[in-house]
């Protein structure tokens, strides 16, 4: 007794095609590209039915159902738009990811994804992972370089990368991306094994204000070349935050220097240091202060720190100096770890050129200069830490 002639489901075909199917004959169903075999709601790898002696097939006919990639994943700091039609997530449907304007920019691809036959949303480059909305760095309300100790009060949005670090002593740092803080090794050395002890605050101008964005540290990475109590060479550290912060006009990361950045950091070029450190009155500043200071010739700075009480070789090639020969403008205790920033006139973005590290016992002293960790020397170290963790 032959079995009923198998009618292929829509978007599928039967193989082999025979005039009739008798006992032990079989057929398979193959779906067109973009369709998958489903038995009920369950996907099948393959389908073969065998004709039984009672003249029936041993399995019910499956469906060839259009591949459904499902609702696309949410994009952190971004959004998704259905291009093909509202909520359409099936084969060949198109969606468009975009990032929140102003403060984020899309990395990896152009954000256009298509539902492919394998059931994955796939970019035009073939990527199945989400694009990345990366914070825009170096945006500031302060647009001029030119004309804290001997400094002036910062205004909202001037230094949105500024981070206040509490835990032991008062120190500073600069936001990188949306979950890292760049600072000085000596500022966080005591907390390197107790990262959670660091109280990290951002988005505020007033040191004592209750209105700030709180962040907590997940891990502290101190440069392996830094030796506590033996000078300040390699005085650089990274703090990984346990959560990403939301970027806005008051919280924005600083850019890392491009390869070409040294052209904006020559002798007499103006950098800007900011912080809540000691002012001329000898107290920690209540309001965030900043000072515009010129870069000092490296040999001149080295010579200034060659005489006692400073040991020979205090100033290394991993440092840069800034300040006025006449004194009066400087970073000071409590500013440690903060960024010395420069305006990249080509990109119109601010970047971190130095990290407040050390200086003379008396801040702003004539003939002495503030010494900063030279960030451009540590770009590979920074990039390795951030990519590995």
């Amino acid at each position: 007794q032959p079995c009923p002639y198998p009618m292929a489901p829509p978007n599928g075909h039967v193989s082999p095609v025979q005039a009739k199917y008798i006992l032990k004959d079989s057929f398979s169903i193959f779906c067109e590209t973009g369709y998958e075999l489903l038995q009920g709601h369950l996907p099948l790898k393959s389908f073969t039915a065998v004709c039984q002696k009672d003249g029936s097939w041993d399995r019910p006919m499956p469906a060839c159902s259009i591949v459904d990639c499902g609702p696309p994943d949410d994009l952190p700091s971004g959004r998704v738009e259905y291009i093909t039609g509202p909520g359409v997530t099936t084969y060949k449907a198109v969606i468009q990811y975009s990032c929140e304007e102003t403060f984020y920019t899309m990395k990896v691809n152009d954000g256009k994804y298509v539902c492919e036959a394998d059931g994955f949303w796939t970019s035009s480059k073939g990527e199945k992972s989400l694009p990345v909305c990366e914070p825009v760095c170096g945006l500031s309300a302060k647009t001029t370089g030119g004309r804290i100790y001997g400094g002036q009060k910062a205004k909202p949005g001037d230094f949105p990368w500024q981070v206040l670090i509490l835990g032991g002593t008062t120190a500073a740092g600069a936001l990188l991306y949306d979950n890292w803080v760049l600072t000085a090794a000596h500022a966080v050395y005591e907390q390197k094994h107790d990262a959670s002890a660091l109280d990290i605050r951002m988005g505020t101008l007033k040191r004592l204000s209750p209105h700030y964005t709180q962040a907590w540290s997940e891990a502290v990475f101190i440069h392996e070349g830094y030796t506590h109590d033996a000078g300040f060479d390699n005085d650089i550290a990274l703090i990984k935050l346990n959560n990403k912060v939301v970027i806005n006009s008051n919280i924005t990361p600083i850019c890392l220097p491009r390869k070409e950045a040294e052209s904006f950091m020559r002798t007499d070029d103006i950098g800007t240091a900011s912080g809540w450190g000691l002012t001329q009155r000898g107290f920690l500043a209540r309001n965030l202060m900043y000072v515009d200071i010129p870069i000092v010739d490296h040999q001149k700075c080295t010579a200034a720190y060659e005489k006692p009480p400073y040991p020979r070789g205090s100033v290394t090639a991993n440092m840069l100096c800034a300040g006025l020969e006449s004194g009066g403008k400087d970073a000071c205790r409590g500013d440690s770890g903060g960024a010395l920033v420069f305006l990249d006139s080509e990109t119109e973005r601010w970047f971190v050129g130095g990290i407040v590290s050390w200086g003379s016992m008396n801040c702003g002293e004539a003939g002495q200069y503030g010494v900063y960790t030279k960030v451009i020397n540590y770009i590979p170290w920074i990039e390795n830490i951030i990519s590995d963790f």
Partner: antibody
Framework: QVQLQESGPGLVKPSETLSLTCTVS??????????WGWIRQPPGKGLEWIGS???????YYNPSLKSRVTISVDTSKNQFSLKLSSVTAADTAVYYC??????????WGQGTMVTVSS | SYELMQPPSMSVSPGQTASITCSGD??????AYWYQQKPGQSPVLVIY???KRPSGIPERFSGSNSGNTATLTISGTQAMDEADYYC?????????FGGGTKLTVLG
């Protein structure tokens, strides 16, 4: 993102009926893309699938439990429910609800512990 | 009734590759799924339809399935991968789970 939350009594007497509800938030239970499933895990043991339901009411049950299980759906409340009758101590387990998308369970609820004891 | 068998436990050193197997009659003819469950937590899907990885699951997780055996492979195993792993398949529209494998990451 869709989240699931199980609720119901943590203690049921032997021979009575265990009743649990799963509330879906962040998405519609009426989506044509999904079934919704129940899975349980006795203390210190492995996972056991109980059954799955579509928003229209279509169900699949584990044959070993089929005679005692009823899964229903309430689209107006964005909930689906499990009833397991004639329970014994062997039904003591953490009961999970999960979204069943073409056979894969993702995501899962946090689970609720149900103890069968007099 | 259909059964899926897994080794109850296995251990691996950090950075090494862990291969967790799941065997069942003609398992390669149907799709296998893998779930990770950490103590006190709900299971999380790590592989579906033999070798597909949901978004958010690290690339070190991969899967294969042929013959009578499905395999979950974790390359460059990390301490955070220590968990119970369950395979699952659908046979005749019935969901079946393996007994689970406890993966211990040494050190």
């Amino acid at each position: 993102q869709v989240q699931l939350q199980e609720s119901g009594p943590g203690l049921v007497k032997p021979s009575e009926t265990l009743s649990l509800t799963c509330t879906v938030s962040g998405g519609s239970i009426s989506s044509s893309s999904y079934y919704w499933g129940w899975i349980r895990q006795p203390p210190g043991k492995g996972l056991e699938w109980i059954g799955s339901i579509y928003y229209s009411g279509s169900t699949y049950y584990n044959p070993s439990l089929k005679s005692r299980v009823t899964i229903s759906v309430d689209t107006s409340k964005n909930q689906f429910s499990l009833k397991l009758s004639s329970v014994t101590a062997a039904d003591t387990a953490v009961y999970y609800c999960a979204r069943d998308r073409r056979g894969r369970f993702d995501p899962w609820g946090q689970g609720t512990m149900v103890t069968v004891s007099s | 009734s259909y059964e899926l068998m897994q080794p109850p436990s296995m251990s691996v050193s950090p950075g090494q590759t862990a291969s967790i197997t799941c065997s069942g009659d003609k398992l390669g003819d149907i799709y296998a799924y893998w779930y990770q469950q950490k103590p006190g937590q709900s299971p999380v899907l790590v592989i579906y339809q033999d070798n597909k990885r949901p978004s958010g699951i690290p690339e070190r997780f991969s899967g294969s399935n042929s013959g009578n055996t499905a395999t979950l492979t974790i390359s460059g195993t990390q301490a955070m991968d220590e968990a119970d792993y369950y395979c699952q398949a659908w046979e005749s529209s019935t969901g079946v789970f393996g007994g689970g494998t406890k993966l211990t990451v040494l050190g």
